[in-house]
């Protein structure tokens, strides 16, 4: 359908760069969560930082183009980078409205499929863009 995709929008304080320009922020009548209507894709993304005890959302918004993974109905994150020892960035892409609001599941840290602790290391801001 020709309707544009609408995603949850969030950027954690301290994250460098912004994906706000990839869409139009909507007035939803509530402060959170914010919604963004995508300009260049029909695809939402989410990035979570998984540590030993919890998962914390880093960014949510629109992708700049449609690519593999965008056909997914749900957010199924996969590991992408290590911003610091003991933490892993997981990202998802999905193609339904607000599909990036939450993830279906995250594998526990250190489980098969998670990069080893000697995987790529980066400064926190840089690792977000590596994950994207």
């Amino acid at each position: 359908p020709p309707n544009r995709r609408t995603c949850v929008f969030f950027e954690a304080p301290g994250v460098r760069g912004s994906t706000k320009t990839l869409g139009e922020l909507l007035d939803t009548g509530t402060e959170l969560p914010r919604a963004i209507r995508c300009l260049y894709s029909r695809c939402c993304f989410g990035i979570w930082n998984l540590t030993q005890d919890r998962a914390q959302v880093e960014m949510q918004g629109c992708r700049d183009s449609d690519e593999p993974g965008c056909e997914s109905l749900h957010c199924d994150p996969s590991p992408r980078a290590h911003p610091s020892p003991g933490s892993t960035l997981f990202t998802c892409s999905c193609g339904t409205d607000f599909c990036n609001a939450n993830y279906s599941h995250l594998p526990p840290p250190g489980s098969p499929g998670t990069p080893g602790s000697q995987g790529p290391q980066a400064a926190p801001g840089e690792s977000i863009w590596m994950a994207l």
């Epitope: 020709p2 309707n3 544009r4 320009t21 139009e24 909507l26 007035d27 209507r37 260049y40 700049d64």
Partner: antibody, heavy 117, light 111 residues
Framework: QVQLQESGPGLVKPSETLSLTCTVS?????????WNWIRQFPGKGLEWMGY???????SYNPSLKSRITISRDTSKNQFSLKLSSVTAADTAVYYC??????????WGQGTLVTVSS | DIQMTQSPSSLSASVGDRVTITCRAS??????????MHWYQQKPGKAPKLLIY???NLESGVPSRFSGSGSGTDFTLTISSLQPEDFATYYC?????????FGGGTKVEIK
């Protein structure tokens, strides 16, 4: 501020390809925005033709999809329109326009293209 | 495609008049309560100029006598007190669905 300027031939023969270029000044076409082509027919109706985004992705009006190509030359800060197999019905004023959102805040002055033998 | 119908197609008015132009979409142009309807002014030989975006937001530098309202399928552009420089053609545009589409225009002429 953002400024746009269309250039290209004002007369194209039927069945040939219409080619126009838009030169952008005051802003890098790779920084942000969608870079659009819009045309206005002699009867004054406006038609959005398509865009190329700052990242290089394109979106076209389905009514033109088989005939239209929008490309860019980042070194010259230009984007271009090619419309193939033109007929007299493609006679129009062609505008390039920049859009940060889904409305058009920045326009070129327009260039008249006549399709005639 | 969403069809945009403007009315009237032309009107005659005097300086100081209150002028109302309507635009009706063939289907809703709202997304989660946000209206993706925009208005432009065009003078002869010039490119269209953005006046109002997202139904009711005044573009920077546009005089406050211009206002927009509406939601769903029915929208209005109002000029509260027509000035000599306002004689022009006005267009609506929707961007709720691809492809973006424009209304046929309303020409405001001097009475």
């Amino acid at each position: 501020q953002v400024q746009l300027q269309e250039s290209g031939p004002g007369l194209v023969k039927p069945s040939e390809t219409l080619s126009l270029t838009c030169t952008v000044s005051g802003y890098s076409i790779t920084s942000d925005f969608a870079w659009n082509w819009i045309r206005q027919f002699p009867g004054k109706g406006l038609e959005w033709m398509g865009y190329i985004s700052f990242s290089g992705s394109t979106s076209y009006n389905p009514s033109l999809k088989s005939r239209i190509t929008i490309s860019r030359d980042t070194s010259k800060n230009q984007f271009s329109l090619k419309l193939s197999s033109v007929t007299a019905a493609d006679t129009a004023v062609y505008y390039c326009a920049g859009s940060r959102y889904s409305w058009f805040a920045y326009w070129g002055q327009g260039t008249l293209v006549t399709v005639s033998s | 495609d969403i069809q945009m119908t403007q009315s009237p197609s032309s009107l005659s008015a005097s300086v100081g008049d209150r002028v109302t132009i309507t635009c009706r979409a063939s289907e809703s142009v709202d997304t989660y309560g946000n209206s993706f309807m925009h208005w432009y002014q065009q003078k002869p030989g010039k490119a269209p100029k953005l006046l109002i975006y997202r139904a009711s937001n005044l573009e920077s530098g546009v005089p406050s006598r211009f206002s927009g309202s509406g939601s769903g399928t029915d929208f209005t552009l109002t000029i509260s007190s027509l000035q000599p420089e306002d004689f022009a053609t006005y267009y609506c545009q929707q961007s709720n669905e691809d492809p973006y589409t424009f209304g046929g225009g309303t020409k405001v002429e001097i009475k």
